[in-house]
């Protein structure tokens, strides 16, 4: 015998209260694929997430975050906040990425610059808070394990929200 | 089926440091929210802090700041908390708890580490 | 920071309706979510994103946060609800708040 929910089409449950016909998703609710004994609650978009795509009979509502913020996770499950480039977040807010260190992105950490030495290369454009330097070739008489800037790894806390 | 395992419990003297595990097992690690949560007796529960695995992000209380470092380890799947000055009001059980992948709750929670201050 | 403000207590006679409160600056702007937590015991989930319930909470729990409130409701409320409970706020960053908890006695 043929299970009479699989003729339920997405958009509808099965509601066995009502000898198994299919009936429409309450408002806020949705199912995706058919035959389902019951829709699932809309995902609501509250807080420092905004709206991207409403949610509908067949789909769930996606979020994504307010602007100074961007998204982390599988279906933006968290905002964090924006840095500007040259800036890293840190758990007192964003910070100047340090000397030898630099970040391209308004999120993230500031990473090291490259060592050109250690391809046996020199410094061609010098390095910023928010850009790699460029390796260009070996001057004369260049060994390898000068003319680069090894910064330290910088100790980080990253992490902040607003208040 | 997810389970956070946290670290047994630990007696420490004033002005000295704790630092409580919280390991996870039976799913994705890195992607999920893992904060800490303490509870002192007979009181009610202080959001303390908060770390992604995945994306190196932490954050904390304000009352904490400065005095917590929340960080974890992928490779064992493993959060830790670390509180320093501790003074007697820090005596409190200590929980990590897990939020769910795209909502505010805490659905899966260790089973608690009591940490007692005492001289 | 949002402060979330709980009654100390809460009493309901069995098969009653039990209302807990939990009131802040706009949280109906936010997420709530409640936990129960039994002496002993770590807090457990019952409540998340306002009005939803986690897979094996009985139906009798349910929740609705709007304007400065939310609030959990027990509908038939039944000697094992006997117990503490916490709301919590999410602002979709990582940082929560929690409520200072309300003690609910079935009596």
């Known amino acids: 015998l043929q299970d009479p929910c699989s003729n339920c089409p997405a958009g509808t449950f099965c509601d066995n209260n009502r000898n198994q016909i299919c009936s429409p998703c309450p408002p806020n609710s949705f199912s995706s694929a058919g035959g389902q004994r019951t829709c699932d609650i809309c995902r609501q978009c509250k807080g420092v997430f905004r709206t991207r795509k409403e949610c509908s009979s067949t789909s769930n509502a996606e979020c994504d975050c307010t602007p100074g913020f961007h998204c982390l996770g599988a279906g933006c499950s968290m905002c964090e906040q924006d840095c500007k480039q040259g800036q890293e977040l840190t758990k007192k807010g964003c910070k100047d990425c340090c000397f030898g260190t630099f970040n391209d992105q308004k999120r993230g950490i500031c990473r090291p610059w490259t060592n050109c030495s250690l391809d046996g290369k020199s410094v061609l454009v010098n390095g910023t808070k928010e850009r790699d330097v460029v390796c260009g070739p070996a001057s004369a008489g260049f060994s390898p394990g000068t003319s680069s800037v090894t910064p330290p790894a910088p100790a980080r806390e990253p992490g902040h929200s607003p208040q | 089926q997810v389970q956070l395992v946290q670290s047994g419990a630990e007696v420490k003297k004033p002005g000295s440091s704790v630092k409580v595990s919280c390991k996870a097992s039976?799913?994705?690690?890195?992607?999920?929210?893992i904060s800490w949560v303490r509870q002192a007796p007979g009181q009610g529960l202080e959001w303390m802090g908060g770390?992604?695995?995945?994306?190196?992000?932490?954050n904390y209380a304000q009352k904490f700041q400065g005095r917590v470092t929340i960080t974890a380890d992928e490779s064992t799947s493993t959060a830790y908390m670390e509180l320093s000055s501790l003074r007697s009001e820090d005596t409190a059980v200590y929980y990590c708890?897990?939020?769910?992948?795209?909502?505010?709750?805490?659905?899966?929670w260790g089973q608690g580490t009591l940490v007692t201050v005492s001289s | 920071d949002i402060e979330l403000t709980q009654p100390p207590s809460v009493s309901v006679a069995p098969g009653q309706t039990a209302r807990i409160s939990c009131s802040g600056d706009?949280?109906?702007?936010?997420?709530a979510s409640w936990y129960q937590q039994k002496p002993g015991q770590a807090p457990v989930l019952v409540i998340y994103?306002?009005?939803n319930r986690p897979s094996g909470i009985p139906e009798r729990f349910s929740g609705s946060n709007s304007g400065n409130t939310a609030t959990l409701t027990i509908s038939g409320t039944q000697a094992e609800d006997e117990a503490d409970y916490y709301c919590?706020?999410?602002?979709?960053?990582?940082?929560?708040?929690f409520g200072g908890g309300t003690k609910l006695t079935v009596l």
């Open positions: 919590q706020t999410w602002d979709g960053t990582l940082h929560f708040v």
């Open positions: 039976g799913g994705t690690f890195n992607s999920y929210a």
């Open positions: 706009n949280l109906g702007d936010y997420y």
């Open positions: 770390i992604i695995p995945g994306f190196g992000t932490a």
């Open positions: 708890a897990r939020k769910n992948e795209e909502d505010g709750g805490f659905d899966h």
């Open positions: 994103d306002d009005s």
